[in-house]
């Protein structure tokens, strides 16, 4: 199957400078997220400028098929991949000037999913077997959000709406969205 990623120009998303993210919903066992409970860098703002409009977050359009075993959606679905680190728009890839990638020294602002949309998808199976329709949740927009000591790098891929985020530690499967043929393309995703 051809898993395709289509890049658009960077979309400017204003970071929520004063906001500390709520920990995502978790199960009782608190193992949903790989939290750094101790340590972490002090929570100070990494940005020198006071003009928050200078900071951007890239939204990549990602088109894929929904699959369940041998069954595949009749049509591909398109969602967004929230890509890379939030930084000055002038230094983002695709921005005018093609400047060097900017990385703050303090706590990260990250480009993460903001809103989701649900879509019902009809699957088709080989041999004419009739599968049921499925509902998928697709990223509809992204935002810059400040990461505090509660979040570490490995958690970036787990920002999302699910209550019972599955545990994926037993197999070395890539975690990033679009982790098929375009894995390198989306190296910075989430």
């Amino acid at each position: 199957q051809g898993w395709q990623a289509f890049k658009n120009d960077a979309t400017e998303i204003i970071p929520e400078l004063g906001e500390y993210p709520e920990p995502p919903p978790e199960l009782e066992n608190n193992k949903t997220m790989n939290r750094a409970e101790n340590g972490g860098r002090p929570p100070h703002h990494p940005f020198e400028t006071k003009d928050v409009s200078e900071y951007s977050c890239r939204e990549l359009h990602f088109t894929r098929y929904v699959t369940d075993g041998q069954c595949r959606s009749a049509k591909p679905v398109t969602e967004l991949v929230c890509s890379g680190q939030c930084g000055p728009a002038r230094l983002l890839p695709n921005a005018i000037g093609r400047g060097k990638w900017w990385r703050p020294s303090g706590p990260d602002f990250r480009c993460i999913p903001d809103r989701y949309r649900a879509q019902r998808v009809q699957l088709l199976c080989p041999g004419g077997a009739a599968p049921r329709a499925r509902k998928v949740r697709l990223v509809a927009s992204c935002k810059c959000k400040r990461l505090t000591r509660f979040h570490n790098q490995s958690e970036l891929k787990d920002f999302g709406p699910e209550a019972a985020r599955p545990q994926k530690g037993r197999k070395p499967r890539p975690r990033a969205r679009g982790a098929k043929a375009n894995q390198a393309e989306l190296e910075n995703a989430y």
């Epitope: 919903p25 929904v66 699959t67 369940d68 075993g69 041998q70 069954c71 989701y116 649900a118 019902r120 077997a129 009739a130 599968p131 049921r132 499925r134 509902k135 998928v136 949740r137 891929k157 709406p161 699910e162 209550a163 019972a164 985020r165 599955p166 994926k168 197999k171 499967r173 890539p174 975690r175 990033a176 969205r177 679009g178 982790a179 098929k180």
Partner: antibody, heavy 124, light 106 residues
């Protein structure tokens, strides 16, 4: 906390009607399929049907088709299971469950959130 | 309708022993999901998509299989593992559960 909260236990007489509820907390039920599962005393789990609260589309297991009605009110994030005329054989525990979804290069679905169950007792 | 048959119906084992539960489908399914239910509680997800461990579930639980034959394995039973286990298929309507396997203390 993401959860499904079901209405309380019911004791009814044969022939009476009943509507039990399942309310989504900290998520919108319209974004997921909500399922109803029956468990008769000392027995296993039986899938009754599902609803897409976004548009009210339902599917039923053949044995429950015409016996119960599944509905939802997405504005209050609540799904319902109702009977127009109860029988003694409807005595059971009824669970609602959310069909969760996850994508990491593969698509995954599973019943990730369950209600606490509603006990329905039908006895003359 | 895809019928899921679980065997054995009851498994009597001691803590520390290995438990192997089977689920056989009447026709091929993409994946099987496993749930654990304790008395007076709602079921809880253990294994999804045949072999993926759900959040917070200990690594002593594992799943395998394909097509029509699937297995849930508990490598070393802990006291809290004594419960009823159900397999489920979500691929085709009507959705179906297996009849359950009760794992009891020997």
């Amino acid at each position: 906390e993401v959860q499904l909260v079901q209405s309380g236990a019911e004791v009814k007489k044969p022939g009476e009607s009943l509507k039990i509820s399942c309310k989504g907390s900290d998520f919108e039920i319209k974004d997921y399929y909500i399922h109803w599962v029956r468990q008769m005393p000392g027995k296993g789990l039986e899938w009754m049907g599902q609803i897409d609260a976004e548009d009210g589309e339902t599917e039923y297991a053949p044995r429950f088709q015409g016996q119960v009605t599944i509905s939802a009110d997405k504005s209050i994030s609540t799904a319902y299971l109702q009977w127009s005329s109860l029988k003694a054989s409807d005595t059971a525990m009824y669970y609602c469950a959310r069909e969760g979804y996850y994508y990491d290069g593969r698509d995954y679905w599973y019943f990730d959130v369950w209600g606490q169950g509603t006990t329905v007792t039908v006895s003359s | 309708e895809i019928v899921l048959t679980q065997s054995p119906a009851t498994l009597s084992l001691s803590p520390g022993e290995r438990a192997t539960l089977s689920c056989s489908a009447s026709s091929s399914v993409s994946y099987i999901h496993w749930y654990q239910q304790k008395p007076g509680q709602a079921p809880r997800l253990l294994i999804y998509s045949t072999s993926e461990l759900a959040s917070g579930i200990p690594a002593r639980f594992s799943g395998s299989g394909s097509g029509t034959d699937f297995t849930l394995t508990i490598s070393s039973l802990e006291p809290e593992d004594f419960a009823v286990y159900y397999c489920q298929q979500l691929s085709h309507l009507p959705l179906t559960f297996g009849g359950g396997t009760k794992v009891e203390i020997k």
